[in-house]
Interface confidence: medium
Amino acid sequence: LEVQVPEDPVVALVGTDATLCCSFSPEPGFSLAQLNLIWQLTDTKQLVHSFAEGQDQGSAYANRTALFPDLLAQGNASLRLQRVRVADEGSFTCFVSIRDFGSAAVSLQVAAPYSKPSMTLEPNKDLRPGDTVTITCSSYQGYPEAEVFWQDGQGVPLTGNVTTSQMANEQGLFDVHSILRVVLGANGTYSCLVRNPVLQQDAHSSVTITPQRSPTGAVEVQVPEDPVVALVGTDATLRCSFSPEPGFSLAQLNLIWQLTDTKQLVHSFTEGRDQGSAYANRTALFPDLLAQGNASLRLQRVRVADEGSFTCFVSIRDFGSAAVSLQVAAPYSKPSMTLEPNKDLRPGDTVTITCSSYRGYPEAEVFWQDGQGVPLTGNVTTSQMANEQGLFDVHSVLRVVLGANGTYSCLVRNPVLQQDAHGSVTITGQPMTFPPEA
């Protein structure tokens, strides 16, 4: 029995759902009562999911797996793995038995984008040319381990005196801290780039060191200027910091996070105590870091509805506040391509090619092109529908008159993640070929 799986690893973002594709060719007269299907971890042989005696036997893997019951009879034995974790990374084997046996293994590569790096400076005041300063670049909650690059304002790499450490948290996600020691010139810009090698995602930050301005009376509250981009289902850190004076104690601190527009309370800290979340119990502070002036808020299991501006209010003796924007994103799935009609095609026939990509956010940009890379703009209709979670399903329809043969490609772009998902179909005399779905 021939069992087919994708050759390339399936790349899945932490917190999202992944489909491990597996298929077999059912013979005529095949019924589900004949099927025995087992998914297991290749290395340990730990059972993940099974189907036997015409029934889905359910998940044996943290209740996070599911089959596609309506597609089994057509030979689709794929496994859906929900809320992917770092610990899920590895090889899964799909065993199929009808009368004969067959099996194949598919690799799951887990990834998580790194946050925009935060930069700190030590010492951070009264700096003069010739002083040695330590610049720390910190980026959080990524996977796998990052590559870190430093450069100066002219783009020249800085390699000397760099120490980078990467620590995995309980979820296996890495926090990266890279320290650069430099002797200051008159002024200078220092940039840090944190690269995710699997996602080919780069997160940049830079610090320009100039003479410090004198402090004002109010508490200076600092938040990132750029929106925090968070993937649906993952956790996001909304950074907020203040500079505690010598002798500062948490008993003096009043901290409030709220939604900027509606002023709805999100989280608070007062009287030396974390007063907890008022926002769906999905927020947390960093209690161990508050005394150092870190008032950041952790927002768990981000949803589309969380997008918007959050204000961080800090009061010690004086008041200060600043707002940080949360931009929510979700990658679009690899497009599936369908053809209508899909047989007995001849040059001159008009065909409708549909490109469908699912569960992305925000709305996608869709581009069509032919085999030579020439854009196809005429006779394209694209619709985008949001589901209950606010995620968009994109359906783009291209009507073309066939030449002798041709390749038609569809590109679905997520404008926030700058993520492109491609699908293509090649139409020849007979038969037609669809590239295998990853």
Epitope: N254, I256, K263, L265, R273, D274, A278
Partner: antibody
């Protein structure tokens, strides 16, 4: 001495709105949360929601979320509770109460709101 | 929502005698910060409620030491060691660990 002085009794028609005020003195108004609680005749106490005067942050009891609006005027140290789409079962004494986010120590004298056609 | 159940509903007392009121919550009142936000209020006839006990067992300023609170988790008790005539009114327990904050139905204390 902490004092919370509320506005006078109101008689309202069903479907209308009422706005109750609560003027605070004797403490730093901006620094403490203001809660609102109501008590229907012969009944127990029911928490409506709270507001932080400095930031304007609010947190409502879901039961009142679409009808109650809590606001403050920091310049006069006054908190307000507006309840819309009134019905007869909203007839009650409405209290403001000052304290922290997780408690309330000092109560106003109460404002009687009667809803009757 | 957390349901707070008080007993008894009515408590006739003799001055100088002790009195005890029970309050039970439908869920633990231990907050994520490990404190327990259970309070006791007294509402005297024609007045606003006044705070007696906060965080289970702490007397509010100016409250006589004949009032004491105890309990943990879901079961709590208010005790008056020697009832005085001025103690009459309705006693309420209240939780503010979980939103929405909720109150017990009240216990009416009256002199026999």
């Amino acid at each position: 001495e902490v004092q919370l002085v509320q506005s006078g009794a109101e008689v309202k028609k069903p479907g209308s709105s009422v706005k109750v005020s609560c003027k605070a003195s004797g403490y730093t108004f901006s620094s403490y949360w203001m809660h609102w609680v109501r008590q229907a005749p012969g009944q127990g106490l029911e928490w409506i929601g709270l507001i932080h005067p400095w930031s304007g942050s609010t947190n409502y009891n879901e039961m009142f979320k679409n009808r109650a609006t809590l606001t403050v005027d920091r310049s006069t140290s006054t908190a307000y509770m507006e309840l819309s789409s009134l019905r007869s079962e909203d007839t009650a004494v409405y209290y403001c109460a000052g304290g922290g986010r997780l408690y309330f120590d000092y109560w106003g004298q109460g404002t009687t709101v009667t809803v009757s056609s | 929502d957390i349901v707070m159940t008080q007993s008894p509903l009515s408590l006739p007392v003799t001055p100088g005698e002790p009195a005890s009121i029970s309050c039970r919550s439908s869920q633990s009142l231990v907050h994520s910060n490990r404190d327990t936000y259970l309070r006791w209020y007294l509402q005297k006839p024609g007045q606003s409620p006044q705070l007696l006990i906060y965080k289970v067992s702490n007397r509010f300023s100016g409250v006589p030491d004949r009032f004491s609170g105890s309990g943990s988790g879901t079961d709590f008790t208010l005790k008056i060691s020697r009832v005085e005539a001025e103690d009459v009114g309705v006693y309420y327990c209240s939780q503010s660990t979980h939103v929405p904050y909720t109150f017990g139905g009240g216990t009416k204390v009256e002199i026999k």
